[in-house]
């Protein structure tokens, strides 16, 4: 099992303890209760663009 704080997921993905792997945050709008989606809320997805400097 992954130790928290090690092998972080790439931007736009989040760790799923249910699947033992990084999962794409893009699926969270369709199914927001997936366990990894909590981690997605903490960081913007890769495609997110800041609207301010």
């Amino acid at each position: 099992e992954r130790v928290p704080g090690t092998t972080p997921c790439s931007r736009g993905s989040s760790w799923s303890a249910d699947l033992d792997k990084c999962m794409d945050c893009a699926s969270c709008p369709a199914r927001p209760h997936s366990d990894f989606c909590l981690g997605c809320a903490a960081a913007p997805p890769a495609s997110f663009r800041l609207l301010w400097p």
Partner: antibody, heavy 120, light 108 residues
Framework: EVQLLESGGGLVQPGGSLRLSCAAS????????MMWVRQAPGKGLEWVSY????????HYADSVKGRFTISRDNSKNTLYLQMNSLRAEDTAVYYC?????????????WGQGTLVTVSS | DIQMTQSPATLSASVGDRVTITCRAS??????LNWYQQKPGKAPKLLIY???SLQSGVPSRFSGSGSGTDFTLTISSLQPEDFATYYC??????????FGPGTKVEIK
């Protein structure tokens, strides 16, 4: 060829215990989530329990929570279901099934099932 | 919990018929819907996943459609080996997976 072979079913009295096993072969067991699903005689399918690939995360249907424990031994390619405090309503064929490679989405391979009968 | 219903409960059909089975969810489940076939005394077999994707090895006469709350499984030309019970299953609320009650396809 992917194969899942359940064993351990049988007749048990109410309040008794059983441990089911599911031996996996024909694929690399450790990366896959696994599930138990049951089917009472003449009835439909009911999801029972889920375990993550590492075994670190488990989930249970409300009907078995606190009585059943799912576990796995990846070195033996085997899935288990420890069933305690059995009730008549637990009588069913119990199937182990392999989860899909995304988020719990489907069950792509199933065992042949093992019958558990709870009766005095 | 998300409830799944199927209609009809039993369907009588002949070889060669086009058969449609409906599955309805009590709330929107996007496309997180799968279909299984089960023959007496056998384990269920995955036919369709993600509402419309055909599982490897499943004949192309089987197809699935729908999203949200309403889904259909269609068998374009019923074959003798297709007489069985069909179940839908939602995986939207995973791990609280639920199955429909089943539709039995029998010989007319």
């Amino acid at each position: 060829e992917v194969q899942l072979l359940e064993s351990g079913g049988g007749l048990v009295q109410p309040g008794g215990s059983l441990r089911l096993s599911c031996a996996a072969s024909g694929f690399t067991f450790s990366p896959y989530p696994m599930m138990w699903v049951r089917q009472a005689p003449g009835k439909g399918l009911e999801w029972v329990s889920y375990i993550s690939p590492s075994g670190g995360k488990t989930h249970y249907a409300d009907s078995v929570k606190g009585r059943f424990t799912i576990s796995r031994d990846n070195s033996k390619n085997t899935l288990y279901l420890q069933m305690n405090s059995l009730r008549a309503e637990d009588t069913a064929v119990y199937y182990c099934a392999r989860g899909g490679d995304t988020y719990f989405d489907y069950f792509d391979y199933w065992g042949q099932g093992t019958l558990v009968t709870v009766s005095s | 919990d998300i409830q799944m219903t199927q209609s009809p409960a039993t369907l009588s059909a002949s070889v060669g018929d086009r058969v449609t089975i409906t599955c309805r969810a009590s709330q929107s489940i996007s496309s997180y819907l799968n279909w299984y076939q089960q023959k007496p005394g056998k384990a269920p077999k995955l036919l369709i996943y993600a509402a419309s994707s055909l599982q490897s090895g499943v004949p192309s006469r089987f197809s699935g459609s729908g999203s949200g709350t309403d889904f259909t499984l269609t068998i374009s030309s019923l074959q003798p080996e297709d007489f069985a019970t069909y179940y839908c299953q939602q995986s939207y609320s995973s791990p609280g997976i639920t199955f429909g009650p089943g539709t039995k396809v029998e010989i007319k």
